[in-house]
């Protein structure tokens, strides 16, 4: 008996062929006997089956004696024997039906987990391996299950059902909600605008949720609110926002705050946070203001950061063109009596300047 | 050119036959299918059957099973339609029609002219 | 038996007016199986499309046919005097072979 595995949905094309290369009468049954489909002349005829109006066939094979059975937008239950009766022969196809469907939404959060189903027809026996687009690899029976989702799982998997050495194909989009980064840092001079960019790691038609950006100063003994909004049709609105700093917020994706202007005290770490309706957890994204100041007070220059520096930035002052006078792996440094000229505050991470300061020291006569 | 040219009117009395002729030219006659169709006055089009004039095999609807009867005469490129125990409800235009089979599609593409049968008593 | 079933009965429009012609059929049937016809008062009907889709030998391209499943439908861009006739859909899914009940489109 020969096997055909078809996916829930789907279209099916159970072949029938006859010795004799012309239009002859033929007739398809399930294994209750009951009529599907069969010919009279040029024309379908169909029987009390359930498949009544998801039945047909291919009229323009007929006269090479080609009589198909077509199944469309498969069911499970549509699992059975099959069978072509023409030229007084039979015909026999076990036609089995998958289907494979992620048991919550396939727009998911980052870090929750992906459970895919497998609905099979009773008595079989199948196995399922499924690759992410990352080329994971998970196998499974009835269930397969992904915990802790990364946005390199989103995209395109690839599942793979084998029953009775056929196998059977499933792509199944997934989507994983996420930030495009985790983790942000913004380097700024004291008095600079500041842009953080808070963009989205996919595309959905419709995204309506609602945010907050958490603020840690360095200096402050407690994090603060510093802004809450609402996201509608991906149209952002501000609900509340703090007297200082007085963030902007732009009205279009992605998600764009403007601090007017850096300044040691907002110096510091911050958490924006977006739920999104209909979705149980949120998005995060962390982002790190690093502020520096570059000073002259009488004999004293004084260069300094505030915010979140790793141990390995070097913090330098050099007059320009010239060799640094002082470097160090701290959050200040300073030069006494310094020459006149322009003086550069530099911080760099090997080499490479992520900040710079200039300020004038002037002649002293 | 292609033409399926029908016997004249006929007037019949309820329980009388009436056979309608079909004369088709221009084509190979064993072919094509012959459909046959009727119309009452004012009414819509209702299928009766087919024939294939190659094999002679022929298929109608269960409402006319029993009183139609369609046949062919090849030599002559004739089909024939006869309907017996004639009631009033009869009374119609009588159409043949060429089915063309043409991959999956059928379609009626040549009419003849349609022959008036009037059942009265 | 697939019913078919046409709306609206009439349809009176003037020439230069889209004329839009809809066939609902009792249960799904393939775009492959429905076919349009013409009808004159005293005339044999006359095939437009076949396939749902396809327009016929010499059939003006004022007339489209669209739908798939269920509802089908027959477009007249821009009504001309000589498309003032009956309009009749056709199923040929599967035996018997019915026709909807028959669209009359008139002048207004």
């Known amino acids: 008996k020969k096997v055909v595995l078809g996916k829930k949905g789907d279209t099916v094309e159970l072949t029938c062929t006859a010795s004799q290369k012309k239009s002859i009468q033929f007739h398809w049954k399930n294994s209750n006997q009951i009529k599907i489909l069969g010919n009279q002349g040029s024309f379908l005829t169909k029987g009390p089956s359930k498949l009544n109006d998801r039945a047909d066939s291919r009229r323009s094979l007929w006269d090479q004696g080609n009589f198909p059975l077509i199944i469309k937008n498969l069911k499970i239950e549509d699992s059975d024997t099959y069978i072509c009766e023409v030229e007084d022969q039979k015909e026999e196809v076990q036609l089995l039906v998958f289907g494979l469907t992620a048991n919550s939404d396939t727009h998911l959060l980052q870090g929750q987990s992906l459970t895919l189903t497998l609905e099979s027809p009773p008595g079989s026996s199948p196995s399922v391996q499924c690759r992410s687009p990352r080329g994971k690899n998970i196998q499974g029976g009835k269930t397969l299950s992904v915990s802790q989702l990364e946005l390199q799982d989103s995209g395109t998997w690839t599942c793979t059902v084998l029953q009775n050495q056929k196998k059977v194909e499933f792509k199944i989009d997934i989507v994983v909600l996420a930030f495009q980064k985790a983790s942000s840092i913004v380097y700024k001079k004291e008095g600079e605008q500041v842009e953080f960019s808070f963009p989205l790691a996919f595309t959905v038609e419709k995204l309506t949720g609602s945010g907050e950006l958490w603020w840690q100063a360095e200096r402050a003994s407690s994090s603060k609110s510093w802004i809450t909004f609402d996201l509608k049709n991906k149209e952002v609105s501000v609900k509340r926002v703090t007297q200082d700093p007085k963030l902007q917020m732009g009205k279009k994706l992605p998600l764009h705050l403007t601090l007017p202007q850096a300044l040691p005290q907002y110096a510091g770490s911050g958490n924006l946070t977006l739920a999104l309706e209909a979705k149980t957890g949120k998005l995060h994204q962390e982002v790190n203001l690093v502020v520096m100041r570059a000073t002259q007070l009488q004999k004293n220059l004084t260069c300094e950061v505030w915010g979140p520096t790793s141990p390995k930035l070097m913090l330098s002052l050099k007059l320009e063109n010239k060799e640094a006078k002082v470097s160090k792996r701290e959050k200040a440094v300073w030069v006494l009596n310094p020459e006149a000229g322009m003086w550069q505050c530099l911080l760099s991470d090997s080499g490479q300047v992520l900040l710079e300061s200039n300020i004038k020291v002037l002649p002293t006569w | 050119q292609v033409q399926l040219v029908q016997s004249g009117a006929e007037v019949k009395k309820p329980g009388a036959s009436v056979k309608v002729s079909c004369k088709a030219s221009g084509y190979t006659f064993t072919s094509y299918d012959i459909n046959w169709v009727r119309q009452a006055t004012g009414q819509g089009l209702e299928w009766m059957g087919w024939m294939n004039p190659n094999s002679g095999n022929t298929g109608s609807t269960q409402k006319f099973q029993g009183r139609v009867t369609m046949t062919r005469n090849t030599s002559i490129t004739t089909a024939y339609m006869e309907l017996s125990s004639l009631r009033s409800e009869d009374t119609a235009v009588y159409y043949c029609?060429?089915?063309?089979?043409?991959?999956?599609?059928?379609?009626?593409?040549?009419w003849g002219k349609g022959t008036t049968v009037t059942v009265s008593s | 038996e697939i019913v078919m079933t046409q709306s609206p009965a009439t349809l009176s429009l003037s020439p230069g007016e889209r004329a839009t012609l809809s066939c609902r059929a009792s249960q799904s049937i393939s775009s492959s199986y429905l076919s349009w016809y013409q009808q004159k008062p005293g005339q044999a009907p006359r095939l437009l499309i076949y396939g749902s889709s396809t327009r016929a030998t010499g059939i003006p391209a004022r007339f489209s046919g669209s739908g798939s499943g269920t509802d089908f439908t027959l477009t007249i861009s821009s009504l001309q005097p000589e498309d003032f006739a009956v309009y009749y859909c056709?199923?040929?899914?599967?035996?018997?072979?019915?026709f909807g009940g028959g669209t009359k489109v008139e002048i207004k």
């Open positions: 056709q199923q040929d899914d599967h035996l018997p072979l019915t």
């Open positions: 029609a060429r089915g063309v089979l043409k991959g999956d599609y059928y379609y009626m593409d040549v």
